[in-house]
């Protein structure tokens, strides 16, 4: 009969974690909106945190947010102002993996 | 080992230009944001501008903006801060720091500073 | 630009004592602060990053902490070396903003 550990051993033979695509620099204007895209795929599905400038990304209201995606997870800033010039990272994990990217926003 | 060695301070006239260096080795320098910081005789410390070398950004500190320009050559793993129409009260210590992202997020290497002397 | 109000501006201790200085963000900086150390005529040195992670090859005596968008940096037994001014910054927004500095002197 099949256990439990055997499932478990199944998945994890199955279990992967892939950084689909860098994450891209951009630049842009005061005051428009920039989208910074972290492209990972895995099994199980990652948890995916960000990070700017080595710190937790804050979210702000109707300004700052991230939220998953098909494709992982995407990072929005409207109304971009000077101060949000910096390194901007995603970190993605599956639990036994960790896979990540950074770009700059200017 | 990573280091930063800045040169040009001098004493220059009120109106006067002035360009500083600053060397880097020791690590990939187009990677990352090289800040000048300075420091007036007595008083702490006060940033001035960082530039992106991979992508020639830049951002200037209000009090020093259309007065000085940072710019970079990664050929030379060198930046500059060409510094025209001084006033008295840029006299100060430059310093040009790293930005030490990812693992540490701070200004992880100093030079060792270049005074600059405002004076008629 | 945001505001690091640091405090005090300077304070007199003796080898041995703990000491305390902190700052305070005019806003959220997540948790993007570091300290720095200086003497007279050296540049600074980094601490602390991250708030509360210890720079490799400084002395354990030296910690960070973070309460919201107050910091601080503690010296848990002064030592002869450590009489000098600190500053704190916030990276977590450009341009990284300084402390205004706390000397610490000998009692």
């Known amino acids: 009969p099949t256990s439990s550990w055997n499932i478990s051993s199944e998945l994890n033979k199955d279990s992967y974690l892939t950084l689909d695509e860098p994450m891209n620099n951009i630049t842009t204007s005061l005051g428009q909106t920039a989208e910074l895209h972290c492209k990972v795929s895995g099994n199980p599905p990652p948890t995916i945190r960000w990070f700017k400038n080595d710190a937790p990304v804050v979210q702000e209201p109707r300004r700052l947010s991230f939220r998953s995606t098909i494709y992982g997870s995407r990072l929005r800033i409207r109304n971009l102002d000077t101060t949000d010039t910096g390194y901007f990272q995603c970190v993605a994990t599956n639990g036994k993996e960790v896979v990540s990217s950074t770009g700059v926003l200017f | 080992e990573v280091q930063l060695v800045e040169s040009g301070g001098g004493l220059v006239q009120p109106g006067g230009s002035l360009r500083l260096s600053c060397a880097a080795s020791?690590?990939?320098?187009?990677?990352?944001?090289i800040h000048w910081v300075r420091q007036a005789p007595g008083k702490g410390l006060e940033w001035v501008a960082l530039?992106?070398?991979?992508?020639?950004?830049?951002y200037y500190a209000d009090s020093v903006k259309g007065r000085f320009t940072i710019s970079a050559d990664t050929s030379k793993n060198t930046a500059y801060l060409q510094m025209n129409s001084l006033r008295a009260e840029d006299t100060a210590v430059y310093y040009c720091?790293?930005?030490?992202?990812?693992?540490?997020?701070?200004?992880?290497?100093w030079g060792q500073g270049t005074l600059v002397t405002v004076s008629s | 630009d945001i505001q690091m109000t640091q405090s005090p501006s300077s304070l007199s201790a003796s080898v041995g004592d703990r000491v305390t200085i902190t700052c305070r963000a005019s806003?959220?900086?997540?948790?993007?602060v570091a300290w720095y150390q200086q003497k007279p005529g050296k540049a600074p040195k980094l601490l602390i990053y991250?708030?509360?992670s210890l720079y490799s090859g400084v002395p354990s005596r030296f910690s960070g902490s973070r309460s919201g968008t107050d910091f601080t940096l503690t010296i848990s037994s002064l030592q002869p070396e450590d009489f000098a001014t600190y500053y704190c910054?916030?990276?977590?927004?450009?341009?990284?903003?300084f402390g205004q500095g706390t000397k610490v002197e000998i009692k």
């Open positions: 020791g690590f990939t320098f187009s990677s990352y944001f």
């Open positions: 720091a790293r930005y030490g992202y990812l693992g540490v997020g701070a200004f992880d290497y």
């Open positions: 530039i992106y070398p991979d992508t020639d950004d830049t």
């Open positions: 910054q916030q990276l977590y927004w450009t341009p990284g903003t």
């Open positions: 806003q959220s900086v997540s948790s993007a």
């Open positions: 991250s708030a509360s």
